[in-house]
Interface confidence: medium
């Protein structure tokens, strides 16, 4: 089946990097500076990817593949293939419309991409605020006042008015 | 081809004024919002500001709030950025920058990008 195809399609045998040239009687022509075949059998190249602005170069276009973009310090990929990069934020914050800007009371966002989340809320396993919460670090939950029985644990439990790590309903 | 074209850069004194361009071409232009960001001599690249495809909601980073305008004009396939009471600090090559479509998180990325336009702010 192969040998028949090729024998109608004189383009089936162009390989990856090159295209069926019509204007040069279906001949196989390389594939022009900046673009580029990834399968055989094309008629066209495609444009090589160029990353600019805020993309930088991953990987250099060639014959065979395109380029591949990563994104400049200070912003993260988004998207398929990196079609987009969004602005990094420190720790403790998260991207509004207005840029970055701290986590509110009882949230935290330790990365630097993301949004701020609520604090655990360790009372509804039955546990203590061992750790209180950041605006970098969630709460640390521990154990339940119950199981703190006197010389049980070295640790003692803060007992604060308000639960710190409770986050405002 | 999808192309962002900057113009409007220059030399200017402390407290003057200069009001950048950017050229849309090759897209939808009144389907994306749009973005100014800045890279200051050896430092990375700040967002600026931005603006809502219609027009209706623009954001600005705090250091340039109050100083800096966004416009866009959807006819013209084109956005602007005013920039009065210009600082040393606000040195730096200015590039425009397409932002998502449609109201979602993607508007804060940034996918085609001009070459930008330098600005220079020195006495």
């Known amino acids: 089946f192969e040998r028949t195809r090729s024998l109608q399609d004189p383009c089936s045998n162009c390989p990856a990097g090159t295209f069926c040239d019509n204007n040069r009687n279906q001949i196989c022509s390389p594939c022009p500076p900046n673009s580029f075949s990834s399968a055989g059998g094309q008629r066209t190249c495609d444009i090589c990817r160029q990353c600019k602005g805020v993309f930088r170069t991953r990987k250099e276009c060639s014959s065979t593949s395109n380029a591949e973009c990563d994104c400049t310090p200070g912003f993260h990929c988004l998207g398929a293939g990196c079609s987009m990069c969004e602005q990094d934020c420190k720790q403790g914050q998260e991207l509004t419309k207005k840029g970055c800007k701290d986590c509110c009371f009882g949230t935290f966002n330790d990365q630097k991409r993301g949004i701020c989340r609520p604090w655990t809320n360790c009372s509804l396993d039955g546990k203590s605020v061992l750790v209180n919460g950041t605006k970098e670090r969630d709460v640390v939950c521990g154990p339940s006042p119950a199981d703190l029985s006197p010389g049980a644990s070295s640790v003692t439990p803060p007992a604060p008015a308000r639960e710190p790590g409770h986050s405002p309903q | 081809e999808v192309q962002l074209v900057e113009s409007g850069g220059g030399l200017v004194q402390p407290g003057g004024s200069l009001r950048l361009s950017c050229a849309a071409s090759?897209?939808?232009?009144?389907?994306?919002?749009m973005n100014w960001a800045r890279q200051a001599p050896g430092k990375g690249l700040e967002w600026v500001a931005n603006?809502?495809?219609?027009?209706?909601?623009?954001y600005y980073v705090d250091s340039v709030e109050g100083r800096f305008t966004i416009s866009r004009d959807n006819a013209k396939n084109s956005t602007y950025l005013q920039m009065n009471s210009l600082r040393v600090e606000d040195t730096a090559v200015y590039y425009c920058?397409?932002?998502?479509?449609?109201?979602?998180?993607?508007?804060?990325?940034?996918?085609?990008w001009g070459q930008g336009t330098t600005v220079t702010v020195s006495s």
């Open positions: 090759g897209f939808t232009f009144s389907d994306y919002w």
């Open positions: 603006i809502k495809e219609d027009g209706s909601e623009k």
């Open positions: 920058a397409r932002g998502g479509a449609g109201y979602s998180m993607s508007h804060y990325g940034m996918d085609v």
